[in-house]
């Protein structure tokens, strides 16, 4: 329970203004009314409160809104947002992109990735899906934030907005997120010509299945090694040496540099050594000549 102190008459607060910066923590607790604070939230960010004072103001809002803040308060949080935990944010219902922009600006330069991820999640839930306006806001104010969304949330992305996503927006996306985004991108770019298609689809290839990689290998795409290294391990392993050579084109030489790193290392272990030797790169670790490869996983699947 909170230790209660009475507000001295001369310290009574009738409006939220600059005079409050001179109040001690106990005085703020006793004298600032949470309902008044909520009604005048638009004034708070202009007042240079200390972090300790902001703590008190946060506790006041928590007192007033135990089930989470309404958007009328959230949009005016300003630097008070820095005091919020992901658990606090999870209680919010946010639909306004102006609110999202304001809070993304505040969070810049602070270690708040968990809070920002939760905020974006709440916006997507509040708006029903990750629509084009939300995606545009994220790419403009928080590059990389798209990848903070769960695969479940990303599944609501309509293919029509994929075109607005830039390569750098996907830099921090994990395999499960790319698994969701890749089919949408494939659909979005399906009417493009070969080279144009590859440029567009490249950032999403971390979610591509083996069949699509095989198809790409027939199109002289010359995939760069950075993109290859982001491909799903399971998608790369079934590719033959010839297919990888066609896929990478002149970049195939980079395999030597990456031969100790996944997925290259794992792929090498699956190839016949004499096939690897045809590349002339000195890649070692393939299956020795004369060895028979039994794929037990296939037998298990059949039995």
């Amino acid at each position: 329970d909170v230790e209660r102190t009475t507000c001295p008459p001369e310290k009574e607060v009738h409006e939220i203004d600059e005079s409050l910066i001179f109040y001690k923590k106990r005085e703020l607790e006793a004298c600032v009314d949470a309902a008044l604070l909520a009604a005048q939230m638009d004034r708070v960010d202009a007042i240079p409160f200390t972090y300790e004072q902001l703590d008190v103001l946060k506790h006041k809002l928590d007192e007033l809104y135990p089930q989470g803040y309404p958007e009328s308060v959230i949009r005016h949080l300003g630097h008070l947002f820095l005091k919020m935990s992901p658990e606090d944010i999870r209680k919010w219902n946010v639909t306004s992109l102006e609110t999202l922009k304001a809070l993304l600006k505040v969070s810049k330069g602070h270690e708040m990735s968990a809070q920002v991820a939760t905020l974006i999640d709440r916006v997507v839930v509040g708006r029903g899906q990750l629509d084009k306006d939300t995606a545009d806001t994220l790419t403009a104010f928080c590059p990389g934030c798209l990848c903070s969304l769960s695969p479940e949330r990303l599944s609501s992305v309509p293919p029509s907005i994929i075109g607005a996503v830039r390569p750098q927006d996907l830099d921090t996306c994990g395999p499960r997120q790319l698994d969701v985004l890749y089919p949408k991108a494939r659909l979005a770019f399906q009417n493009m010509s070969g080279s144009e298609y590859f440029v567009k689809i490249r950032p999403f290839l971390g979610g591509a299945p083996t069949e699509d990689l095989k198809a790409l290998s027939q199109q002289n795409v010359s995939m760069d090694l950075a993109t290859f290294m982001k491909l799903r391990r399971e998608a790369v392993l079934p590719l033959s040496v010839a297919e990888v050579q066609k896929l990478l084109g002149p970049h195939v030489e980079g395999l030597k540099v990456e031969e100790q790193h996944s997925p290259v290392r794992d792929w090498i272990l699956k190839q016949r050594q004499d096939d690897l030797d045809t590349l002339g790169l000195g890649l070692q670790g393939g299956i020795p000549n004369g060895y028979l490869i039994l794929d037990l996983s296939v037998r298990e699947a059949l039995s």
Partner: antibody, heavy 119, light 108 residues
Framework: EVQLLESGGGLVQPGGSLRLSCAAS????????MSWVRQAPGKGLEWVSN????????NYADSVKGRFTISRDNNKNTLYLQMNSLRAEDTAVYYC????????????WGQGTLVTVSS | EIVLTQSPGTLSLSPGERATLSCRAS???????LAWYQQKPGQAPRLLIY???SRATGIPDRFSGSGSGTDFTLTISRLEPEDFAVYYC?????????FGQGTKVEIK
């Protein structure tokens, strides 16, 4: 079901004291702002006071400041209004009301208790 | 303090007619913090409208609220016999949380 039940009203002489109570049920009292509103006979509503749930921050109308004290007992789910130095103009029906912070309005009211200040 | 002035003081209308009640504030009030209440003789007030325009639970859609800044309106589109009562506006924008003096809607 939300219920607010006021008690403690009655006849008191000018200068006297009275303590009103409001028993609350059907909601989480410990999370809720509570208010007192009064209505003089044949007149309109007048906001009297309110109190916050955790810090027990209080606010008063100028007409009662220094004479009335609002308080609460979160363990008993009860709101109080201690009225001292009563005047004839304090004669009114006193309502206890729940403040809904999400609506910024008084969404539930008690039936009221009549306080008569007369000699 | 914010003074809320309601007009007219009394509105004499017949059932089925439209009622328009006004609430004017002496200084700007955020629409999120303006509410309307209905009170019938011998009863406690009842919340009708909060946030200037949102109907409280169980309130029929013939009641609507509008306005911003200093001018707010409560409209009853078609008066029913049970709507004849006194109506109050209230602001929670700053302390004290003042009420208007009320508008009585009576049967003509």
């Amino acid at each position: 079901e939300v219920q607010l039940l006021e008690s403690g009203g009655g006849l008191v002489q000018p200068g006297g004291s009275l303590r009103l109570s409001c028993a609350a049920s059907g909601f989480t009292f410990t999370h809720t702002y509570m208010s007192w509103v009064r209505q003089a006979p044949g007149k309109g509503l007048e906001w009297v006071s309110n109190i916050s749930p955790t810090y027990s921050t209080t606010n008063y109308a100028d007409s009662v400041k220094g004479r009335f004290t609002i308080s609460r007992d979160n363990n008993k789910n009860t709101l109080y209004l201690q009225m001292n130095s009563l005047r004839a103009e304090d004669t009114a029906v006193y309502y206890c009301a729940r403040y809904n912070a999400y609506h910024a309005a008084l969404d539930y009211w008690g039936q009221g208790t009549l306080v008569t200040v007369s000699s | 303090e914010i003074v809320l002035t309601q007009s007219p003081g009394t509105l004499s209308l017949s059932p089925g007619e439209r009622a328009t009640l006004s609430c004017r504030a002496s200084q700007s009030v955020s629409s999120s913090y303006l509410a309307w209440y209905q009170q019938k003789p011998g009863q406690a007030p009842r919340l009708l409208i909060y946030g200037a325009s949102s109907r409280a639970t169980g309130i029929p859609d013939r009641f609507s609220g509008s306005g911003s800044g200093t001018d707010f309106t409560l409209t009853i589109s078609r008066l029913e016999p049970e709507d004849f009562a006194v109506y109050y506006c209230q602001q929670h924008n700053q302390y004290p949380n003042t009420f208007g003096q009320g508008t009585k809607v009576e049967i003509k």
